[in-house]
């Protein structure tokens, strides 16, 4: 069918509560495109009827609510004027109950479930609620160890819990709860968050910063050798992994047989407040199949991509 397949990360979700996933894949979805959702390679698109428990809402797939049988691989097909991409999203549903907020043992957990507060600082936790505009979210309540949080040090501000003067005792299991309204029906959303405390505020907080690349394209001739650095700043005591991936697979694994594209050895320079890490990707020979494919640099929760592009023809040579 001429569509290019892209495999996204697994999403691990909670049964009996709403869930939504937005089909966006920069730079593909930045122009005029049509998006259609399918389940498990079905030829029949997901319903667009808003009364359906599972339906497509603009570029989103919306589950109201998620159920056990909803686990599986969902595809969203993005059709542009000259392109077609099929994005595969693996959704795994597990049963999470009220106050079951310690979910660190689950595989591939999103970092939304694991957050850090900085000792002695004013900091915040975020309740990640990703839903389309048709969903109206009520005020958020916050819990710790199954009890509602209160006290002058805690302030709820939109989707955040502000914690002033963070102490070691603020570690533990939190949950944020909101009521979602859609088409006159109400649903409860409950997200568990495991919170740890770190003593260092570090360089720019706890999230690694990718200095380069910056989600851009690189013009490169077919058949040439190309080396691209990923430069990352991070705290000195960080435990983040830095790597290059393509189609959500480590490049060394993806090109295991040909070894045509490889990840380099990581190096770092130590500064007083932070470290600067560099890990490169080497294309021994750029092939046609490499063009238009996002090569992602990952650093903890941060990502940035490059896309190889054929140079525009130079008409001055003719």
């Amino acid at each position: 069918d001429g569509c290019k397949d892209i495999f996204m990360k697994n999403e691990i979700l909670s049964a009996s509560q709403p869930f939504a996933f937005n089909c966006t894949f920069p730079p593909i979805t930045s122009g005029e495109v049509s998006v259609t959702w399918y389940k498990n390679s079905s030829k029949i698109p997901v319903s667009k009827i808003i009364q359906s428990r599972i339906h497509q809402d603009e570029t989103w797939i919306l589950f109201l609510p998620m159920e056990w049988g909803d686990s599986g691989v969902y595809q969203c097909v993005i059709k542009g004027r000259d392109s077609c991409h099929r994005i595969h999203v693996n959704l795994t549903v597990f049963e999470k109950h009220w106050c079951d907020t310690s979910i660190g043992g689950l595989p591939n957990l999103s970092d939304e479930y694991k957050q850090i507060l900085h000792l002695g600082k004013d900091d915040s936790l975020t309740c990640h609620l990703h839903f389309p505009k048709s969903c109206v979210l009520g005020p958020i309540k916050w819990y710790k160890d199954c009890n509602e949080i209160k006290g002058e040090r805690f302030t709820v501000l939109e989707t955040r819990l502000l914690v002033s003067n963070v102490s070691a005792e603020d570690r533990g299991n939190y949950a944020c709860q909101a009521i979602l309204t859609h088409s006159g029906k109400q649903y409860e959303v409950l997200n568990g968050i495991t919170v740890s405390i770190t003593e260092r505020a570090g360089y720019g907080g706890s999230v690694p910063k990718i200095i380069y690349p910056k989600n851009h394209s690189i013009e490169v001739q077919l058949g040439t050798t190309l080396i691209v650095d990923c430069n990352v700043t991070d705290t000195k005591d960080n435990t983040n992994l830095r790597c290059w991936r393509v189609n959500n697979t480590l490049v060394d694994d993806y090109y295991d047989e040909s070894k045509r594209i490889r990840e380099g050895v990581e190096t770092h320079v130590s500064f007083r407040e932070h470290n600067l890490y560099t890990v490169n990707i080497t294309f021994l020979e750029v092939k046609m199949e490499d063009y238009g494919l996002p090569f992602m640099c990952h650093a903890g929760v941060s990502t940035a991509y490059i896309i190889l592009q054929l140079p525009a023809p130079d008409f001055r040579a003719y």
Partner: antibody, heavy 116, light 107 residues
Framework: QVQLVQSGAEVKKPGASVKVSCKAS????????MNWVRQAPGQGLEWMGM????????RYAQKFQGRVTMTVDKSTSTVYMELSSLRSEDTAVYYC?????????WGQGTLVTVSS | DIQMTQSPSSLSASVGDRVTITCRAS??????LNWYQQKPGKAPKRLIY???SLDPGVPSRFSGSRSGTDFTLTISSLQPEDFATYYC?????????FGQGTKVEIK
């Protein structure tokens, strides 16, 4: 570090009341619930109730409802547990336990003996 | 109210033995369960928080796990200082409830 220091042992007559104190230090007192747990001689642990120092909200176990009163003095970071209409089966060690993270820290215990 | 059924009520073991203590909740409590060690005349000391998180300073021979509403405390290699009484506590919903306790004695 976190410390919960309780008042000393008490001997009471049946029908009387006892008030046990628990002074907290080393953490933000008004941010977390404080629980009371008791243990009769040679027996297991029994949750009595809890209080939040921020707004004095209380939750009591059904068994102690009407007999127990938990109060707080924010100025001294102290929580109090008063048990009235004492009977011999109330003879126990009474502990306060903070819920900074669920029942993380415990006081040293206060022995209350009810005897005629 | 949620009942916590702890077993065995007592056990005799030798230094170096692997010891397993179980608590069963009468209804779902998620991971909201702690394990405590208590020695005579002392306050309980928390060993494990939220089913499986080891408290700071607690030896790694202690571990906690869960299967549905069954919770297990395991001591991989019993040491002389481990002879004590162990309790589980559910804090998923009040009234909070403890298991009846397991006394670990020297064989």
């Amino acid at each position: 570090q976190v410390q919960l220091v309780q008042s000393g042992a008490e001997v009471k007559k049946p029908g009387a009341s006892v008030k046990v104190s628990c002074k907290a230090s080393g953490y933000f007192f008004t941010s977390y619930w404080m629980n009371w747990v008791r243990q009769a001689p040679g027996q297991g642990l029994e949750w009595m109730g809890m209080i939040h120092p921020y707004d004095s909200e209380t939750r009591y176990a059904q068994k102690f409802q009407g007999r127990v009163t938990m109060t707080v003095d924010k100025s001294t970071s102290t929580v109090y547990m008063e048990l009235s209409s004492l009977r011999s089966e109330d003879t126990a060690v009474y502990y306060c336990a903070s819920s900074t993270t669920a029942f993380a820290y415990w006081g040293q215990g206060t022995l209350v003996t009810v005897s005629s | 109210d949620i009942q916590m059924t702890q077993s065995p009520s007592s056990l005799s073991a030798s230094v170096g033995d692997r010891v397993t203590i179980t608590c069963r909740a009468s209804q779902d409590i998620g991971n909201a369960l702690n394990w405590y060690q208590q020695k005579p005349g002392k306050a309980p000391k928390r060993l494990i928080y939220a089913t499986s998180s080891l408290d700071p300073g607690v030896p790694s021979r202690f571990s906690g796990s869960r299967s549905g509403t069954d919770f297990t405390l395991t001591i991989s290699s019993l040491q002389p200082e481990d002879f004590a009484t162990y309790y589980c506590l559910q804090y998923a919903s009040s009234p909070y409830t403890f298991g009846q306790g397991t006394k670990v004695e020297i064989k």
